[in-house]
């Protein structure tokens, strides 16, 4: 496959990446109310998010909650928050550098310098991906760890929510497609040493005989 | 041996606030969730409220909701309860208690509160 | 919430004699997840804080006199007391340990 096509394709599932990590940290679904038992006959499922807490009756209506008070949220979700919208923000920061770095683009000149920009939005996108990994996974071993747990109450339990899914597809996606950013910008190089151009010594002048030394040829 | 030992109880005006301490010993206390039990004069018990582990989730009977908080210092091995806009009704003997699995397993001697003008 | 209905409210007994409490909740306590029912008891002498006798509704804690038997399931539940003895006079609460609010019965009270 050409750099161009990875390039293109390394950019498309970040973009769907970015937009499932959008979408991850705006719906209240990161938790849900566990149903254990039989006997415990409820009206209404409970949603916890990021940002809003929402209430679903059997009826099908549902009323949401924003919360009020940032000192009030658990540590999970307080850092779920920072780390999440870093990493949505980060994502934005990496589509222009990919952009800029991207051969159908003329931001930057053609050449190494182009390739180590491209390079850069593909591990941005990496760490992107890892830096949402960390909020989702630490809020999902929360969950599962409490559902466990016999000494919490048994409506105090939950399990994982819809928005932790899409989150880790959101992430694999980023992170994916953040390999083939880094794949493009290396093919498109030809040489793995993206670090600093290759210098080379300016030709001496010609020998007697009018030759140049061979040596100086590459 | 496990001993709780509960202080700071007294007698106080509707409206006003007490902090209750309960001093915990004899067990690893950062591995239980905490608990504190109230018994009004010769009446029966009513929970009040939980703590987890660490301090991070507490859960409250709808009596005290918003106007108790149940809080922890695992390094001092603490459990407390800040108690505001106390009322007559709130007068008891307030039992810490070890929670595990739900249930209470040991008790503090318990403190007498007492809410009057 | 889960009431919790105890009965009787006071009962006269002699040492000896078995002596059975009973307890009924307004919802089952049975867990079909984990296979449980989630109901202890405990005893309070005068003057004293109470004292945990059984757990998850048959399970004494250690410590405990095996006279002291807990039975039941579902919504109905009993303290049977083997052989009464002069230090069992106290009042005994059933209690739910199954979800919050933990709710207490109103208890029953053994008196000579």
């Known amino acids: 496959m050409g750099s161009a096509a990875l390039e293109i394709l390394g950019l498309v599932l970040c973009l769907v990446g970015w937009g499932g990590l959008i979408l991850a940290c705006g719906l209240p679904m990161w938790q849900v109310t566990a149903f254990l038992d039989h006997n415990i006959v409820t009206a209404q499922t409970t949603w916890k998010g990021l940002w809003m807490s929402c209430v679903v009756q059997s009826t099908g209506h549902m009323q949401c909650k924003v919360y009020d008070s940032v000192l009030a949220l658990s540590t999970e979700v307080q850092a779920a928050r920072a780390l999440t919208v870093s990493a949505v923000l980060l994502a934005f920061v990496a589509l222009f550098v990919t952009l800029a770095g991207a051969q159908c683009t003329t931001c930057v000149a053609p050449g190494p310098a182009k390739a180590r920009v491209a390079l850069t939005g593909g591990v941005l996108y990496l760490f992107c991906g890892l830096l949402a990994l960390v909020p989702l996974c630490w809020f999902a071993n929360i969950v599962v760890r409490e559902f466990y747990d016999p000494s919490v109450p048994v409506s105090q339990k939950y399990e994982l929510g819809a928005a932790l899914y899409i989150g880790w597809a959101a992430t694999a996606l980023l992170m994916v497609g953040g390999c083939l950013l880094c794949c493009g910008a290396w093919v498109c190089t030809g040489r793995p040493d993206l670090s600093f151009p290759v210098k080379y010594s300016a030709p001496r002048r010609p020998t007697a005989t009018g030759d140049y030394d061979k040596k100086n040829y590459v | 041996e496990v001993q709780l030992v509960e202080s700071g109880g007294g007698l106080v005006q509707p409206g006003r606030s007490l902090k209750l301490s309960c001093a915990a010993s004899?067990?690893?206390?950062?591995?239980?969730?905490m608990a504190w039990v109230r018994q009004a004069p010769k009446k029966g018990l009513e929970w009040v409220a939980s703590?987890?582990?660490?301090?991070?989730?507490?859960y409250y009977g709808d009596s005290v909701k918003d106007r108790f908080t149940i809080s922890r210092d695992n390094t001092k091995t603490t459990l407390y309860l800040q108690m505001t806009s106390l009322r007559s009704e709130d007068t008891a003997t307030y039992y810490c208690?070890?929670?595990?699995?739900?249930?209470?397993?040991?008790w503090g001697q318990g403190v007498m509160v007492t809410v009057s003008s | 919430d889960i009431v919790m209905t105890q009965s009787p409210s006071s009962l006269a007994v002699s040492a000896g004699e078995t002596v059975t409490i009973n307890c009924k909740s307004s919802?089952?306590?049975?867990?079909?997840?984990?296979?449980?029912?989630?109901l202890a008891w405990y005893q309070q002498k005068p003057g004293q804080s109470p004292k945990m006798l059984i757990y998850?509704?048959?399970t004494r804690e250690s410590g405990v006199p095996d006279r002291f038997i807990g039975s039941g399931s579902g919504t109905d539940f009993t303290l049977t007391i083997n052989t009464l003895q002069a230090e069992d006079l106290a009042i005994y609460y059933c209690?739910?340990?199954?979800?919050?609010?933990?709710?207490f019965g109103a208890g029953t009270k053994l008196e000579l």
């Open positions: 208690a070890r929670h595990p699995r739900r249930y209470f397993d040991f």
């Open positions: 004899g067990f690893t206390f950062s591995d239980y969730f």
């Open positions: 703590i987890n582990y660490e301090g991070s989730r507490t």
């Open positions: 919802r089952s306590l049975f867990s079909s997840g984990y296979q449980e029912n989630y």
């Open positions: 998850l509704a048959s």
């Open positions: 209690q739910q340990h199954y979800d919050i609010p933990y709710t």
